[in-house]
């Protein structure tokens, strides 16, 4: 049975240019975590995997950070980079959970910064 | 059954390399880590490296970069371990284990006596 | 690199009793770990992983448990064939680190 749930930052805005942190945490289960993927859309951005480390996605080395802990860092943020970002903790013996965060990229010098795990 | 047969000793004169050997029987050895393990006399497990024998991905224990290399030959099913310039710092047993991804399986070998004396 | 701090470093206990053996991360290993247990002259042979699920094979009176950093694994009503060390491991990136091990010793 799936006891665990992901804590995410949820929504959150960021100014072009700059850079956020997207932070996923799994809690409620003493499931192991064997690997977390990082997707934008239909698109692997980074893995981590207990046995590898570390895998950023080639077209995205330039600009996405591994940690801190699991969570990613994208920097030179772009409008472009506006859209869904999901967390994807493969775990055993529970199986997949995922998490969903929404960052906004804003024009503006006035960005509203999430609350959680979000860096200024 | 499962095994993992290493040589029960080898004796190595300081400064000669040596290349221990690991052959696996009765699972799948493309499947699993191979890890090479030390232990010195009365003392505990030191985790020398590990190498997936389908592609030969490696990762070595960075206190160990200059000391061991590890190879396999799947055709033959045996893992290698080679110790450069032997010291008596080196004289322990060496395991081999197989350890499926994450440790959800290990297979231990009886493990190599090394002794390094002249 | 990730330290397994494991305690005690020796245990001398009875037959029947529980004992109970810990293990502290230097960091967060999601539980990526496994128990070993060591006889003299002998190869280790897994007793735990995934931090709480044992092998088949394995008496049930052994039992990890155990997220984050801090780990144990207990084992209850010690039977004879249980003396020997212990160790554990990590599973979280490499180097794989052993934790300094437990001797178990018979009172």
């Known amino acids: 049975m799936m006891t665990g749930t992901i804590e995410t930052t949820g929504n959150i805005s960021a100014e072009k240019g700059g850079s956020i942190i997207l932070q996923c945490h799994l809690s409620s289960t003493t499931a192991q975590v064997t690997q977390v993927n990082w997707e934008q859309q239909d698109q692997l951005l980074a893995i981590c995997n207990a046995d590898l480390g570390w895998h950023i996605s080639p077209s995205f080395k330039d600009r996405v950070a591994p940690g801190p802990g699991l969570g990613l860092t994208l920097q030179s943020l772009t409008v472009n980079d506006t859209g869904e970002y999901f967390c994807i903790y493969h775990t055993y013996p529970d199986g997949t959970y995922t998490g969903r965060i929404f960052l906004e990229v804003l024009e503006s010098s006035v960005a509203e910064h999430g609350a959680r795990f979000q860096i200024p | 059954q499962v095994q993992l047969q290493q040589p029960g000793a080898e004796l190595v004169r300081p400064g000669a390399s040596v290349k221990l050997s690991c052959k696996a029987s009765g699972y799948s050895f493309t499947s699993y880590w191979m890890n090479w393990v030390k232990q010195r006399p009365g003392q505990g497990l030191e985790w020398i490296g590990m190498i997936r024998p389908s592609d030969s991905e490696t990762r070595l224990n960075q206190m160990f970069k200059d000391k061991a290399t590890l190879t396999v030959d799947k055709s033959s099913s045996t893992a290698y371990m080679q110790l450069s310039s032997p010291t008596s710092d080196d004289s322990a047993v060496y395991y081999c284990a197989g350890i499926h991804d994450y440790g959800h399986g290990a297979y231990w070998g009886q493990g190599t006596l090394v002794t390094v004396s002249a | 690199d990730i330290q397994m701090i494991q305690s005690p470093a020796s245990l001398s206990v009875s037959v029947g009793e529980t004992v109970t053996i810990t293990c502290r991360a230097s960091?967060?290993?999601?539980?990526?770990l496994a128990w070993y247990q060591q006889k003299q002259g002998k190869s280790p042979q897994l007793l735990v992983y995934?931090?709480?699920h044992l092998p088949d094979g394995v008496p049930s009176r052994f039992s990890g448990s155990g997220s984050g950093t801090q780990y144990s694994l207990k084992i209850n009503s010690l039977q004879s064939e249980d003396f020997g060390s212990y160790y554990c491991?990590?599973?979280?990136?490499?180097?794989?680190?052993f934790g300094g091990g437990t001797k178990l010793e018979i009172k």
């Open positions: 491991q990590h599973f979280w990136g490499t180097p794989r680190t």
């Open positions: 995934a931090a709480s």
């Open positions: 960091e967060n290993i999601y539980s990526n």
